[in-house]
């Protein structure tokens, strides 16, 4: 049975060209995290294998970087950004787990974050 | 240039274990992903496994029961054990290296291949 | 386990025409697929991935497309040296699966 949750840092809002971490916090349960994807839309943006470590998406290399931890950072925001985001927990024996942010750019000088794991 | 050479007996009797090894020059098998795959007659390529350049393994779970990947860095050689095999377990075998970071999954360099025959 | 399913089994073509293989996901692999050719006596070489980038050393009348669960590698002017059989592979999970094989041959 999946007893696990996710937390994640829900929605989130940044400045155009700014950057914002991603993450995801999988809790109460034992299962072994083998893997976790990020992901938006049909876009595979990152890998990280518990044993190989992080494979980035080359359309995606020159903008997003591994960590912190199992997190991921988006770098020269724009607008075209904005969306939803989602971390797939691959476990064993659990199976999939999987948490959503909705990730707003803003164009203006004041973007409010999120309570929870933003770059201040 | 990375090289991976492929030994070990072409003929194995049923319920005995499969043992393969791959030498690999070129190349430190301390870096990247170590892997075996399989094509039996007439089938699909399969996974079995790897072994990560910190050591880690990673066993496919329909053959987890029977199978051990282990290395000799001072030898620079990876190796295969399958155990209680049939005829089933006759196929091509590849040792490969993966290159994650770069190509994710994608497997860069193959063993030219060696042919497991499993009779009595 | 994700099921890879590739169509055609086989495909005969003339040199300088173009050729298409598909490869079907059994579930939304995104774009965590990869493209090899196994020529003949050969071991599987690397010719797309990420389903579509080039490997390095890939001419360019090879392109890969495709996300989700549909994908296709295409050959723009068949040329002898691409016979062989392609294999599309899915490494958005392990275990990492194969389809079962496009063999391209020359009329």
């Known amino acids: 049975m999946m007893t696990g949750t996710i937390e994640t840092t829900g929605n989130i809002s940044a400045e155009k060209g700014g950057s914002i971490i991603l993450q995801c916090h999988l809790s109460s349960t034992t299962a072994q995290v083998t893997q976790v994807n990020w992901e938006q839309q049909d876009q595979l943006l990152a890998i990280c294998n518990a044993d190989l470590g992080w494979h980035i998406s080359p359309s995606f290399k020159d903008r997003v970087a591994p960590g912190p931890g199992l997190g991921l950072t988006l770098q020269s925001l724009t607008v075209n950004d904005t969306g939803e985001y989602f971390c797939i927990y691959h476990t064993y024996p659990d199976g999939t787990y999987t948490g959503r942010i909705f990730l707003e750019v803003l164009e203006s000088s004041v973007a409010e974050h999120g309570a929870r794991f933003q770059i201040p | 240039e990375v090289q991976l050479q492929e030994s070990g007996p072409g003929l194995v009797k049923p319920s005995e274990t499969l043992s393969l090894t791959c030498a690999v020059s070129?190349?430190?098998?301390?870096?990247?992903?170590w892997n075996w795959i399989r094509q039996p007659p007439g089938k699909k390529l399969e996974y079995i496994g790897y072994?990560?350049?910190?050591?880690?393994?990673y066993y496919n779970p329909s053959l987890k029961s029977r199978v051990t990947i282990s290395r000799d860095t001072s030898k620079n050689q990876f190796s295969l054990k399958l155990s209680s095999v049939t005829a089933a377990d006759t196929a091509v075998y590849y040792c490969?290296?993966?290159?994650?970071?770069?190509?994710?999954?994608?497997?860069?360099?193959w063993g030219q291949g060696t042919t497991v025959t499993v009779s009595s | 386990d994700i099921v890879m399913t590739q169509t055609p089994l086989s495909l005969s073509v003339t040199p300088g025409q173009p050729a298409s293989i598909s490869c079907k996901a059994s579930q939304n692999v995104r774009t965590a697929v990869a493209w090899y050719l196994q020529k003949p006596g050969q071991s599987p070489q690397l010719m797309i991935y990420s389903a579509s980038y080039r490997y390095t050393g890939v001419p360019d009348r090879f392109s890969g497309s495709g996300s989700g669960t549909d994908f296709t590698l295409k050959i723009s002017r068949v040329e002898a040296e691409d016979v062989g059989v392609y294999y599309c592979q899915q490494y958005y999970t392990t275990p990492w699966t194969f389809g079962g094989g496009t063999k391209v041959e020359i009329k």
């Open positions: 490969a290296r993966l290159d994650f970071s770069n190509y994710g999954g994608a497997v860069d360099y």
């Open positions: 072994i990560s350049y910190s050591g880690n393994t």
């Open positions: 070129g190349y430190s098998i301390t870096s990247d992903s």
